[in-house]
């Protein structure tokens, strides 16, 4: 089992849309998938959870963060729109 994040480090304009790509490899048909982030102050935050049926984000994600769980692609992409300066962090996909 493995996770691949194919989005490079990126600098984006505030107000734009950003998609962070994540694909996973497993034969399990309903994996638990997660996004976490480490902010510049080194604080660690849960961002989003999802499985085949539902997704749930941390309180700060409301309205601007969403996930695209594309089963056929084994993908769990994180979408931030519009992105803000306070979203600056290193984002990690996990399952």
């Amino acid at each position: 089992d493995k996770v691949t994040q194919s989005s490079p480090d990126q600098t984006v304009a505030s107000g734009s849309e950003v998609v962070l790509l994540c694909t996973y490899d497993t034969v399990y048909s309903n994996p638990d998938l997660f996004w976490y982030r480490i902010r510049p102050d080194y604080s660690f935050q849960f961002v989003f959870y999802g499985d085949n049926s539902r997704s749930e984000g941390a309180d700060f994600t409301q309205g601007r963060f969403s996930v695209k769980h594309i089963l056929t692609q084994k993908a769990f992409h994180l979408v931030i729109s519009p992105v803000r300066t306070e979203d600056s962090a290193t984002y990690y996909c996990a399952f």
């Epitope: 194919s6 989005s7 034969v27 048909s29 996930v67 769980h69 594309i70 089963l71 056929t72 692609q73």
Partner: antibody, heavy 121, light 108 residues
Framework: EEKLEESGGGLVQPGGSMKLSCVAS????????MNWVRQSPEKGLEWVGQ??????????HYAESVKGRFTISRDDSKSSVYLQMNNLRAEDTGIYYC????????????WGQGTLVTVSA | DIQMIQSPASLSVSVGETVTITCRAS??????LAWYQQKQGKSPQLLVY???KLADGVPSRFSGSGSGTQYSLKINSLQSEDFGSYYC??????????FGGGTKLEIK
């Protein structure tokens, strides 16, 4: 609202070429693998091929029956996917659909309305 | 390539009856299977995905089941609007993501 619109179908002679287009709107086109599926009364639904993402180097996969004759390409800046069909045969006649599989939290499969390709002398 | 064997090819039934359509994969597809309904002159409409999950707006009389290589679509208490063609499709592993041969459901 998510929408796929195919165009470019018509009548072509055996051995001829044709290029189909599919324009997408209402979703983040660049993150989805795009597929072409065709349908004929004889064969039912037949998966034709697929193109993946820029991060996959736009990898393509084809059904054995079209390999070497059909080429799928995409232009993410135009939210468009194309099917170049060469050396067409009578058995390629059918309705060609552009489709993609969406997020499991929205809708799982999206299809265009199809465009008819007729290969006949 | 994975082959999808769908049966029966056609079925003539009355309104109110229960119908089961089956699909057998040539190898394990780990529930990566969808069922579609298609009416004459229309694009296919998704009914079920990942073998058992009902797509939005699909009536509860439809249900999908199965695992491994054996899958089925059951329609309880058939309604007149259920008549048409049904197809399974796998989406496991490297394409081609083949469809079954289809089942034509006709009114008796």
């Amino acid at each position: 609202e998510e929408k796929l619109e195919e165009s470019g179908g018509g009548l072509v002679q055996p051995g001829g070429s044709m290029k189909l287009s599919c324009v997408a709107s209402g979703f983040i086109f660049s993150i989805y693998w795009m597929n072409w599926v065709r349908q004929s009364p004889e064969k039912g639904l037949e998966w034709v091929g697929q193109i993946r993402l820029k991060s996959d180097n736009y990898a393509t996969h084809y059904a054995e029956s079209v390999k070497g004759r059909f080429t799928i390409s995409r232009d993410d800046s135009k939210s468009s996917v194309y099917l170049q069909m060469n050396n067409l045969r009578a058995e390629d006649t059918g309705i060609y659909y552009c489709m993609y599989y969406g997020s499991s939290y929205e809708r799982f499969a999206y299809w265009g309305q199809g465009t008819l390709v007729t290969v006949s002398a | 390539d994975i082959q999808m064997i769908q049966s029966p090819a056609s079925l003539s039934v009355s309104v109110g009856e229960t119908v089961t359509i089956t699909c057998r994969a040539s190898e394990n597809i780990y529930s990566n299977l969808a069922w579609y309904q298609q009416k004459q002159g229309k694009s296919p409409q998704l009914l079920v995905y990942v073998a058992t999950k009902l797509a939005d707006g699909v009536p509860s009389r439809f249900s999908g089941s199965g695992s491994g290589t054996q899958y089925s679509l059951k329609i309880n208490s058939l309604q007149s609007e259920d008549f048409g063609s049904y197809y399974c499709q796998h989406f496991w592993g490297t394409p081609p993501w083949t469809f079954g041969g289809g089942t034509k459901l006709e009114i008796k």
